[in-house]
């Protein structure tokens, strides 16, 4: 329906917290440099014009659009071209290419600081003597350092941190309390920004096709009792939700992920039968439970796919008669069948089964040529089987720090050209799949791993289409969004590369490294390891593991020396020389 | 929406031919293979021939082979079936069909052989 006022409406439907929230975000979203203050002086009189617009629908502008409220407040800022360069030509478009405009302005990989977490007391005071401030704070310096997070996910995570700190500052020993739930929900938070950034790259490069077929197998595996109409409304408006957000629609956005919400709560019967604990909770909390609810127990009678779908006459018949209907019909009824398949394998097959009918179909005797397709599908399933089973007893041999070093190593090979940094945080990442899915339920992995990798990978991807330097991971990268994985797994050690000479300061450490936290320290090393295959790239496992052990054995002596920088100054040329000597 | 309008059917005596066309829209007629079926009265559906998306392929059932000769022209997304030496046993409404499909969604064209 028309509302006079949009901003009238999503006022009311959202209430003042939450309406504040997401306008915080969009504008720290869209303009990553401006500081907290900045922000939140616009979005105070932005709530304060949607306040007289509440009062009075007819009043003066309250019937312009969100995009030219918002775009027209944030090309207001002083000196927008001294800090945003190019960026600042937007503000001489008209909407909707404006906003077009700030959406390819943002960087995913913001020149900020680390968001660094200050000491338990010092957040403890802070946030009890404004709590509003202190949330207001959290929501901009995550939202301009990851500006695709989910909107309304990131008010679930904020209001987590709030409820941790209210619990926390209470304790005597607020640190231990803090510390631990505090990087639970970074943790959390972390991967639900590559998971959300990777929808959002489905949806701008391949449109709102591609990312309804990941709702439609996403949905069919969590809800196998749904029919395929109500699977097929719930991906339609999934994708509606997703498309907001990604396009920085964000109070549009959470209005129609909390429609959604209660449309699925008020539909349990049709659509499955764990709902219920989620639909219990307060809104933030049931939109975040419902994202994640465990897979529905599956209809006991199930006919085998073949039946419709390839000993059926009717294939082709069906097919063209209805393509896409045809291809969501197949794609629900085998996600269904596959909880324990990841969502990125399914659409492979889906592909591969329209590929079969676009070839067969085309023949003389389609049903001879279709009939075998359900065996091509065996290798395209064996692949990501292998590669969660090597990956895996990989990972239960050296623990999460030892499985980052062996990707580390392994993708450095494979793309040289890749800045260190990017490859050292792309392997902390991957490695830390093992941790995330390898300690599941054999039915479980599958789909875990290769669904977070995607979502690393697709990280990795946009790294580098800042600054493209490996023809390999352009390869990979310029492919389908469910390719990527394969693609990278297939690499191998890229012949083209002409090592980096050595570089003996690469490898000089100083006593500063012995008070680094251990996070810090294994970067540090990491970059290293990463320096060291740059140089010889056809170096053995074991001379890495030589050359790696060495390393740790002269941080630790230096570092327990009374003398530490005599130590990492005489020690050090040593270790490099031993180095070259074991590499050559 | 997907459309076959069959046409060209009628009433011919023994050893004469009949040309039948199908007009189809609403797909992507040189993407899919074609075929003939066929139903005589008060018996079940018989497949009579195919033919693939170019036109490069033709398929015939025993009872068809050297009478009947499928063909298409996809620039005017139409299918034919020139049938020579017709039977009193051709008697039958003939449709085509997209892919191996057996079972028309159109209302068939009616040929009758008789003397």
């Known amino acids: 329906e028309a509302h006079k006022s949009e901003i009238a409406h999503r006022y009311n439907d959202l209430g003042e917290q939450h309406f504040k929230g997401l306008v915080l975000i969009a504008f720290s979203q869209y303009l990553q440099k401006c500081s907290y203050d900045e922000h939140a002086k616009l979005v105070q009189e932005v709530t304060d014009f949607a306040k007289t617009c509440v009062a009075d629908e007819s009043a003066a502008n309250c019937d312009k659009s969100l995009h030219t409220l918002f775009g027209d407040k944030l090309c207001a800022i002083p000196n927008l071209r001294e800090n945003y360069g190019e960026l600042a030509d937007c503000c001489t478009k008209q909407e909707p290419e404006r906003n077009e405009c700030f959406l390819q302005h943002k960087d995913d990989n913001p020149s900020l600081p680390p968001f660094e977490r200050p000491e338990a007391e010092a957040m403890c005071t802070s946030f009890k003597e404004n709590p509003t401030t202190f949330m207001g704070h959290y929501l901009h310096e995550v939202a301009r350092r990851h500006p695709y997070f989910y909107a309304p996910e990131l008010l679930y995570y904020a209001e987590q941190y709030n409820e941790i700190l209210t619990q926390c500052c209470a304790e005597a020993d607020k640190e231990s309390c803090l510390t631990p739930k505090l990087d639970g929900v970074k943790e959390k938070a972390l991967v639900s920004s590559v998971r959300q950034r990777m929808k959002c790259s489905s949806m701008q490069k391949f449109g709102e096709r591609a990312f309804k077929a990941w709702a439609v197998a996403r949905l069919s595996q969590t809800f196998p009792n749904a029919d395929f109409a109500e699977i097929t409304k719930l991906a339609t408006d999934l994708t509606k939700v997703n498309k907001e957000c990604c396009h920085g629609d964000l109070l549009e956005c959470a209005d129609d992920r909390a429609e959604l919400a209660k449309y699925m709560c008020e539909n349990q019967a049709t659509i499955s039968s764990k709902l219920q604990t989620c639909c219990d909770k307060p809104l933030l909390k049931k939109a975040h439970c419902l994202s994640e609810v465990e897979h529905d127990t599956m209809p006991a009678d199930l006919p085998a796919i073949a039946a419709d779908f390839v000993e059926d006459q009717e294939v082709c018949k069906n097919y063209a008669e209805a393509k896409d209907v045809f291809l969501g019909t197949f794609l629900y009824e085998y996600s269904r069948r596959h909880p324990d398949y990841s969502v990125s394998l399914l659409l492979r097959l889906a592909k591969k089964y329209e590929a079969t009918l676009e070839k067969c179909c085309a023949e003389a005797n389609p049903p001879a040529c279709y009939g075998t397709v359900l065996a091509e599908f065996q290798p395209l399933v064996e692949e990501p089987k292998n590669l969660v089973k090597t990956n895996c007893d990989l990972y239960e041999k050296l623990g999460e720090y030892g499985f980052q070093n062996a990707i580390l190593v392994r993708y450095t090979q494979k793309a040289p050209q890749v800045s260190t940094p990017t490859l050292v945080e792309a392997a902390r990442n991957l490695g830390r799949v093992g941790t995330k899915c390898c300690t599941l339920p054999e039915d479980q992995r599958l789909p875990c791993v290769e669904d977070y990798l995607s979502a690393i990978l697709n990280r990795v991807c946009l790294l580098h289409e800042k600054t493209p330097v490996s023809e390999h991971v352009t390869k990979c990268c310029s492919g389908s969004l469910v390719e990527r994985r394969p693609c990278f797994s297939a690499l191998t050690v890229d012949e083209t590369y002409v090592p980096k000479e050595f570089k003996a300061e690469t490898f000089t450490f100083h006593s500063d490294i012995c008070t680094l936290p251990e996070k810090e320290k294994q970067i540090k090393k990491q970059t290293a390891l990463a320096e060291l295959v740059k140089h010889k790239p056809k170096a053995t496992a074991e001379q890495l593991k030589t050359v790696m052990d060495d390393f740790a054995q002269f941080l630790d002596t230096c570092c327990k020396a009374a003398d530490k920088d005599t130590c990492f100054s005489t020690e050090g040329p040593n270790l490099v020389t031993r180095c070259k000597d074991a590499l050559a | 929406k997907v459309q076959l309008v069959e046409s060209g059917g009628g009433l011919v005596q023994p050893g004469n031919s009949l040309r039948l066309s199908c007009a189809a829209s609403?797909?992507?007629?040189?993407?899919?293979?074609m075929s003939w079926v066929r139903q005589a009265p008060g018996k079940g559906l018989e497949w009579v021939s195919s033919?693939?998306?170019?036109?490069?392929?033709?398929l015939y059932a025993d009872s068809a082979k050297g009478r009947f000769t499928i063909s298409r022209d996809n620039a005017k997304t139409t299918l034919y079936l020139q049938m020579n030496s017709l039977r009193a046993e051709d008697t039958a409404v003939y449709y085509c069909?997209?892919?191996?499909?057996?079972?028309?969604s159109s209302q068939g064209t009616l040929v009758t052989v008789s003397s």
């Open positions: 069909t997209i892919g191996g499909s057996l079972s028309p």
């Open positions: 609403g797909f992507t007629f040189s993407s899919f293979g």
């Open positions: 033919i693939s998306g170019s036109g490069s392929d033709a």
